[in-house]
């Protein structure tokens, strides 16, 4: 099980209307450029076999991947939203830096790896899809971690 006190984000992180709106606007703009509507990255398969107490740890992994492998490489696109949303998400990632899991997290890593593989397989369109799902990432992170 996770060290649950560390796998928490204060509700106030998600109660900032401006940055919430910018995150959703960024997702909307990117989703307009997403041609592949059949694939969903953040959905049931990602959370398959993951207990309630492990969800935040899983979302931390997804957040870190999204920042490092998607948002940083695409940081010049979708302005002005990107320059505001990326630092916000990076702060959330930093606040979850002490969120770890005790024991076996293989099932979580397996699920996250499938998401990573899907993004990589789709190439740049996979990165655009991930940005287009930032609203789902934001909401899933909130629901899992508060």
């Amino acid at each position: 099980a996770p060290i649950s006190s560390h796998c928490r984000l204060d509700k106030s992180n998600f109660q900032q209307p401006y940055i919430t709106n910018r995150t959703f606007m960024l997702a909307k703009e990117a989703s307009l450029a997403d041609n592949n509507t059949d694939v969903r990255l953040i959905g049931e398969k990602l959370f398959h076999g993951v207990s309630m107490s492990e969800r935040c740890y899983l979302m931390k992994q997804v957040l870190n991947f999204t920042l490092e492998e998607v948002l940083f490489p695409q940081s010049d696109r979708f302005q002005p939203y990107m320059q505001e949303v990326v630092p916000f998400l990076a702060r959330l990632s930093n606040r979850l830096s002490t969120c770890h899991i005790e024991g076996d997290d293989l099932h979580i890593q397996r699920n996250v790896q499938k998401l990573k593989d899907t993004v990589k397989k789709l190439g740049e369109s996979g990165e655009i899809k991930a940005i287009g799902e930032l609203d789902l990432l934001f909401m899933s992170l909130r629901n899992a971690c508060i």
């Epitope: 953040i42 959370f47 398959h48 207990s51 969800r55 609203d135 789902l136 909401m139 899933s140």
Partner: antibody, heavy 119, light 112 residues
């Protein structure tokens, strides 16, 4: 095919106990949480409680103490133990699978089993 | 605990009509709202989640919208099989788990 079948309902006297069963097929209880919801005659839906993948249970405040959810993974069955039953517990009781997609959604549902509490 | 208020509690409509049902939450629930359809003597069936995402196999005449406290379920052209009761349902995280899942009171759609 995913299926949920409730059983164990019937007529019970006030103060009595009853154990409902929800037999599932097409998926594993080690991969999904399960919820119980009830519906009094002509009324709306009311959440009772949930049993998570790891066996943790959570209950609506009104259900704590009288209602207990458990499971037997080897039988792929979830149970709802109801004690100290009252007339107002008369309802159709449903089990449903909790699919977390970033938010909890309940799909599919069993057909329900009717519990009548009366003397 | 969040309270979901559905309106109207019942409505009469004809086949082909556009039907709109609203669900108001007593506090901000973001997009943590689902809609279910229940026919007499049957179990509820998931229609919409994330406030606006259509569940698998649900006809495109159903749509959902809203966020925060105000939500809408729309049936663009009512079909004979759509006469049923519709429930909204919210998930509230971060507070006590004993009030995490809440249902609205329901809206019965009847034949005019």
């Amino acid at each position: 095919e995913v299926q949920l079948v409730e059983s164990g309902g019937g007529l019970v006297q006030p103060g009595g106990s009853l154990r409902l069963s929800c037999a599932v097929s097409g998926f594993s209880l080690s991969s999904y949480a399960m919820i119980w919801v009830r519906q009094a005659p002509g009324k709306g839906l009311e959440w009772i409680g949930i049993i998570d993948i790891d066996g943790s249970t959570y209950y609506a405040s009104w259900a704590k103490g009288r209602f207990t959810i458990s499971r037997d993974s080897s039988k792929n069955t979830v149970y709802l133990q109801m004690n100290s039953l009252r007339a107002e517990d008369t309802a159709v009781y449903y089990c449903a699978r909790d699919r977390f997609v970033g938010v909890d959604i309940f799909d599919p549902w069993g057909q329900g089993t009717l519990v009548t509490v009366s003397s | 605990a969040v309270v979901l208020t559905q309106s109207p509690s019942s409505l009469s409509a004809s086949v082909g009509d556009r039907v709109t049902i609203t669900c108001q939450a007593s506090e901000d629930i973001y997009t943590n709202l689902a809609w279910y359809q229940q026919k007499p003597g049957k179990a509820p069936k998931l229609l919409i989640y994330w406030a606006s995402t259509l569940a698998s196999g649900v006809p495109s005449r159903f749509s959902g919208s809203g966020s925060g406290t105000d939500f809408t379920l729309t049936i663009s052209s009512l079909q004979p099989e759509d006469f049923a009761t519709y429930y909204c349902q919210a998930c509230v995280y971060g507070d006590s788990a004993d009030s995490r899942y809440t249902f609205g009171g329901g809206t019965k759609v009847e034949i005019k």
